[in-house]
Amino acid sequence: PKQTLPKPIIRAESTYMVPKEKQATLCCQGSYGAVEYQLHFEGSLFAVERPKPPERINGVKFHIPDMNSRKAGRYSCIYRVGELWSERSDLLDLVVTEMYDTPTLSVHPGPEVTSGEKVTFYCRLDTATSMFLLLKEGRSRDVQRSYGKVQAEFPMGPVTTAHRGSYRCFGSYNNYAWSFPSEPVKLLVTGDIENTSLAPTDPTFPDSWDTCLLTRETGLQKDLALWDHTAQNLLR
């Protein structure tokens, strides 16, 4: 079998949901010494980057300016060390937002409910679309999908304090082209008096994977690695 290098990690910097005409940035984290990185879009080569100096950088950023529906879709990346290529990264779905109109999000029975109550979100958009998406802020990868002509419902079932948070919805014209986001709806879930104090509020931190963790190896890092290697040999 043909030898390959380990697959790189592909990430979107800040978010994978990019408003139209704005810039998307994708990071491909491979390995120190990689002389070339390639970004592929829907199976075709999209862009190339050659880090300088290759031995000091473990990844690259690919910039996609002027986002539109032609650039929305599935991206992956590979890298090369010498003549040896890596396996392909996992696929990353890049979505263009702020297309066409703005949906309206509502919640029944209301935004303030008690733990255990059944809650349903309704997303309405009058222009032609059949797929609707509901996202919780800070959990943008957990997309719920629902279908309907002009309105879709998202039954949450009996809620707990873990459902607390801010929600938005989108209408979707295809998997990668979404409408403007709705205004946020904040769901407040109160529990029993004993439980309420213990229930953690859901943090709305940005998604942890939406960060580029590329590092530039310094001379000091190299010296420390060499020192560590020498120390290990002495201990043996």
């Epitope: 810039q23 879009f41 080569l45 999209f46 862009a47 190339v48 980057e49």
Partner: nanobody, 126 residues
């Protein structure tokens, strides 16, 4: 708004050379990544060569070693030097730009480019 105007096309014999030029208007040229594409009659537009804002280059396999892309930021112009031309190089050649860009990405996919020229015809025949 960026405008791109190609020139330098014409008729040449197999084995001959041509240099295409693409003049860009606007002050954003130095921050633009540039590329050349071509479209032969009855075929799809295909990538030929590209250059990043930091002068890194990438070529289609079919032209590697025969074509050279370069840029002159002072003149707001990108060039395609074509040598050892073959009949299969006959096509309309288009210049394209990605504006703005950051870093030194070289763009290969036509969807990446947001500005295009009108094209210049290159005909290779005996």
């Amino acid at each position: 708004e960026v405008q791109l105007v190609e020139s330098g096309g014409g008729e040449v014999q197999p084995g001959g050379s041509l240099r295409l030029s693409c003049a860009a208007s606007g002050r954003t040229f130095a921050s633009a990544a540039m590329g050349w594409f071509r479209q032969a009659p009855g075929k799809e537009r295909e990538f030929v060569a590209a250059i990043s804002r930091s002068d890194d280059t990438y070529y289609a396999e079919s032209v590697k070693g025969r074509f050279t892309i370069s840029r002159d930021n002072a003149k707001n112009t990108v060039y395609l030097q074509m040598s050892s031309l073959r009949a299969e190089d006959t096509a309309v050649y288009y210049c394209a730009a990605v504006v703005p860009t950051y870093g030194s990405n070289i763009y290969v996919h036509s969807a990446a480019y947001n500005y295009w020229g009108q094209g210049t015809l290159v005909t290779v025949k005996p």
